[in-house]
């Protein structure tokens, strides 16, 4: 099987979601989790981590092989206490495998302005709030 | 034993919005896709969406996009489906059901005693 | 979307006689056809998945059948408690639908 996994951001006015999804067959969503860790270069683990989700079991229709889970991480206002750097992660509770993603940064300027980078080229981000910018 | 019970009957306005829930009890509730499907006075089922509350994907069918948002509670294991811009021809029994174990079930095994909503001015 | 075409709309037979309602797709669905029967006044109940599978606690008079685009779901011998109304509905892809449904009513 192959499992993939990716990170991308999207801004709604000040908020700031934070986004990891999981591409994977049905079966095997089981015992996976998917979690993200924040300034956690070497120990990223649920235990560790901002937020963590199972993986979907289930893709609510039947005419598919891959489903897509998403665990999204919201910053309401982004302030300096959130600069940093950031990395999607899943690991398998039953058979150990551990997938790890890119890693992405948080900056936050003197101006009070932050900026998003790491992020795939792929991931299509527009803000539409001059507050923040994704590169 | 699962059980879905739903809220009350609503009488609204045209224009005004309403929120139905539906409290799920005795299984894993963000394990399992939440369906949201009306029946209008002698017509047939009309799916409305669903939403896996899990990580809250939600899917909503055309006719209902920018009208009908879906929402789970996980902390309550409540599902709720919010119409918004009602007309009269929103009157219905509001159904939520759970979508079954996919390839072991797949279809809607249980399902919420229906919320009737009348919209009239 | 997938369009679920249900025939015939009224079939009005009698205690003991065979019914067979007819569910047709407007795409291939493979066997994810799931079959309902709804009583007046009631919520819809789950009677057949996967076009054929059993569901435990419906009784053996019912049946499914077909694949792809055609269904069948057959009553073998008519209950006076099966005069009801049938649904269809798929679960290929998005958006889920229904079919329009087949009311049975006692001739």
């Known amino acids: 099987g192959c499992i993939n996994i990716t990170s991308s951001a999207s801004q709604e006015g000040t908020r700031l979601n934070l986004i990891c999804t999981v591409w994977h067959k049905k079966e095997e969503a089981e015992g996976f989790v998917v979690f993200l860790c924040k300034d956690r270069s070497g120990d990223c683990s649920p235990e560790t981590s901002l937020k963590q989700l199972r993986l979907k079991r289930d893709p609510g229709i039947d005419g598919v092989g891959e489903i897509s889970s998403q665990l999204m991480f919201t910053i309401s206002q982004v302030t300096p206490l959130h600069s940093g750097t950031y990395q999607c992660c899943a690991r398998s509770q039953k058979s150990g495998i551990r997938l790890q993603g890119h890693f992405f940064s948080i900056l936050f300027t003197e101006t009070g302005n932050y900026t998003v980078t790491g992020l795939k080229q792929r991931q299509h981000l527009e803000f539409s709030h001059n507050e923040g910018t994704l590169s | 034993q699962v059980q879905l019970v739903q809220s009350g009957a609503e009488v609204k306005k045209p224009g005004a919005s309403v929120k139905v829930s539906c409290k799920a009890s005795?299984?894993?509730?963000?394990?399992?896709?939440m369906q949201w499907i009306r029946q209008a006075p002698g017509q047939g089922l009309e799916w409305i969406g669903a939403?896996?509350?899990?990580?809250?994907?939600?899917r909503v069918t055309q006719k209902f996009r920018g009208r009908a948002t879906l929402t789970a509670d996980k902390s309550t294991s409540t599902a709720y489906m919010e119409l918004s811009s009602l007309r009269s021809e929103d009157t219905a029994v509001y159904y939520c059901a759970r979508r079954g174990i996919a390839a072991v079930v797949g279809g809607f095994d249980y399902w919420g005693q229906g919320t009737t909503l009348t919209v009239s001015s | 979307e997938i369009v679920l075409t249900q025939s015939p709309a009224t079939l009005s037979l009698s205690p003991g006689e065979r019914a067979t309602l007819s569910c047709r797709a407007s795409?291939?669905?493979?066997?994810?056809l799931h079959w309902y029967q709804q009583k007046p006044g009631q919520a819809p109940r789950l009677l057949i998945k996967?076009?054929?599978q059993s569901i435990s606690g419906i009784p053996a008079r019912f049946s499914g059948s077909g694949s792809g685009t055609d269904f069948t779901l057959t009553i073998s011998s008519l209950e006076p408690e099966d005069f009801a109304v049938y649904f269809c509905q798929q679960s290929n892809s998005w958006p889920l639908t229904f079919g329009g449904g087949t009311k049975v009513e006692i001739k």
């Open positions: 005795g299984y894993t509730f963000t394990d399992f896709w």
């Open positions: 939403i896996y509350p899990g990580d809250d994907d939600a």
């Open positions: 795409q291939s669905i493979s066997n994810h």
């Open positions: 996967y076009a054929s």
